[in-house]
Amino acid sequence: QPSVSPGEPSPPSIHPAKSELIVRVGNEIRLLCIDPGFVKWTFEILDETNENKQNEWITEKAEATNTGKYTCTNKHGLSSSIYVFVRDPAKLFLVDRSLYGKEDNDTLVRCPLTDPEVTSYSLKGCQGKPLPKDLRFVPDPKAGITIKSVKRAYHRLCLHCSADQEGKSVLSDKFILKVRPAFKAVPVVSVSKASYLLREGEEFTVTCTIKDVSSSVYSTWKRENSQTKLQEKYNSWHHGDFNYERQATLTISSARVNDSGVFMCYANNTFGSANVTTTLEVVDKGFINIFPMINTTVFVNDGENVDLIVEYEAFPKPEHQQWIYMNRTFTDKWEDYPKSENESNIRYVSELHLTRLKGTEGGTYTFLVSNSDVNASIAFNVYVNTKPEILTYDRLVNGMLQCVAAGFPEPTIDWYFCPGTEQRCSASVLPVDVQTLNASGPPFGKLVVQSSIDSSAFKHNGTVECKAYNDVGKTSAYFNFAFKGNNKEQIHPHTLFTP
């Protein structure tokens, strides 16, 4: 017996006093536990456990399935064990065919032997196929065969336990190894949309997609700076062996303004964690904000083109857009398009293309846009710059020479006298009277200026030039003088266009 100190409890003694015992199939298993404080026998093999409160365990006709560990325990909790092999030539292996292995860990193929004296206890591939070259295993007759450091490539590997019994190779039932992959990277997480804009009362629903090698990845939706448990629904798929996808959908059936905030989809595995966020903004009602891309006061030269461009934010989506001029709606010459193709886009662009503008086409151009909640508009004041045009140039009955010119900006009229036959008129003549005729008229038309000089001041033959000009250009008109005796001849006006 084991040596123990006097008074110190000792483990029970089992008879026969062997660590391992072989009993032939059909024979009796008789095991005696001797201990003054005997409590029970227990039997274990694979996942089976039996108990017996008699101090002598008797199995009258041993079967292969009686192979296993018999443990006697006393009232002090001390125990002794004997392992009994029931040798049955017809059943060399006890098998538990469930076989799971965690990648990079060892796993046990549970095929304990009923006869420990057989040889070549090992693993073999099914249908004569070789095992993977790097597969290493360690046999143990009482437990089975341990596969060392399981690889992902072993998934669905079919194998048998094998042993040589009286010169013949015997195979167990087949095992299919299912490998649980190890996490070697953080989960991949993505969200259906990065931001959401909703009106109060609308449903908020966002889906997070979590991808990993197995379903044991953990995931949850969290609200930033809040511990409140959110309601989620899950859908999941296995796309092949080590490609798992889960969709976690968060829903708020009737969103409120105070639901606005950042929501995080968090996932972790044994390797690490990953997260992705989405932003929810809940507004009490829709809105439209317009931003002109050019100055709302536009100056354009006659005959040139101009594009009136606005960007605008509209939520919900814009329903009606129009450009208006003089109470007339443009049916063409404009386009409206979203600023981006992003599903969350609320920003749009509208462009009105005005081509070869005439002086008469200045005025207020208005962009109007509306959605189901609000209307908004913006006005552009377009001024068409035109070169002065001399409308009239006359000698009045009172001897005055009068020149009337129109243009935008307001033209300036200068007078020059050219003596004799000189072509260049340099001597300026001060006007007697200058008036802007339509200063109080429509604000976007041409401005008309009238200027007069006194022809009695001229004593010699010559030409008088009326020159009208502004920022765009200039135009001149001429009056010819001839003296016969003391009388002035009729003055013949003519114009000379100066581009």
């Epitope: 017996q1 084991p2 062997k18 015992l21 009993v23």
Partner: antibody, heavy 121, light 107 residues
Amino acid sequence: EVQLVESGGGLVQPGGSLRLSCAASGFTFVDHDMDWVRQAPGKGLEWVGRTRNKLGSYTTEYAASVKGRFTISRDDSKNSLYLQMNSLKTEDTAVYYCAREPKYWIDFDLWGRGTLVTVSS
Amino acid sequence: DIQMTQSPSSLSASVGDRVTITCRASQSISSYLNWYQQKPGKAPKLLIYAASSLQSGVPSRFSGSGSGTDFTLTISSLQPEDFATYYCQQSYIAPYTFGGGTKVEIK
């Protein structure tokens, strides 16, 4: 060759001591439980005692007739079994056999040739 | 201790005879019974273990049977080399007691 060879026997006076040795060869000594069996001249076989292997925690068991006087020990590194006999009596006179138990049963499947111990004044 | 009683203590037989030796245990020992053969001046030799299992290398004319308390060793056809003393031994509970032996002699 698989064998057990006993040594250390001889003539000893009553009350004396003797140490028998058993050298094992040709098999894995550490795997086996080992026993001593004796046979008095012209008599039957008598089991003396045994020592378990490492798996059996080197537990020892003895026949009532020798308990407290004889001690069985083993040295796995030397593949050797020992029987220390103290307080010898004349009735301990016998041929002492070293015997091997198989791994999975209690019987004696290999025996030494024996060594004679004579206790006499 | 478990007592083992062997009978007969001796018997005379001729070559070719069928010989039966019995062994009785004082309590049930299941199949924990072994049979040995010993020739004068030699160490014993294991013949049968676990009541009925023939030890490797032992001729098949030797057989064992029984369970519980009553056991039998049978030599189906006695051969000249079989003249020896035969012992039974229980291996259930220490001390592992032997029977007194049966001497098989030439008639």
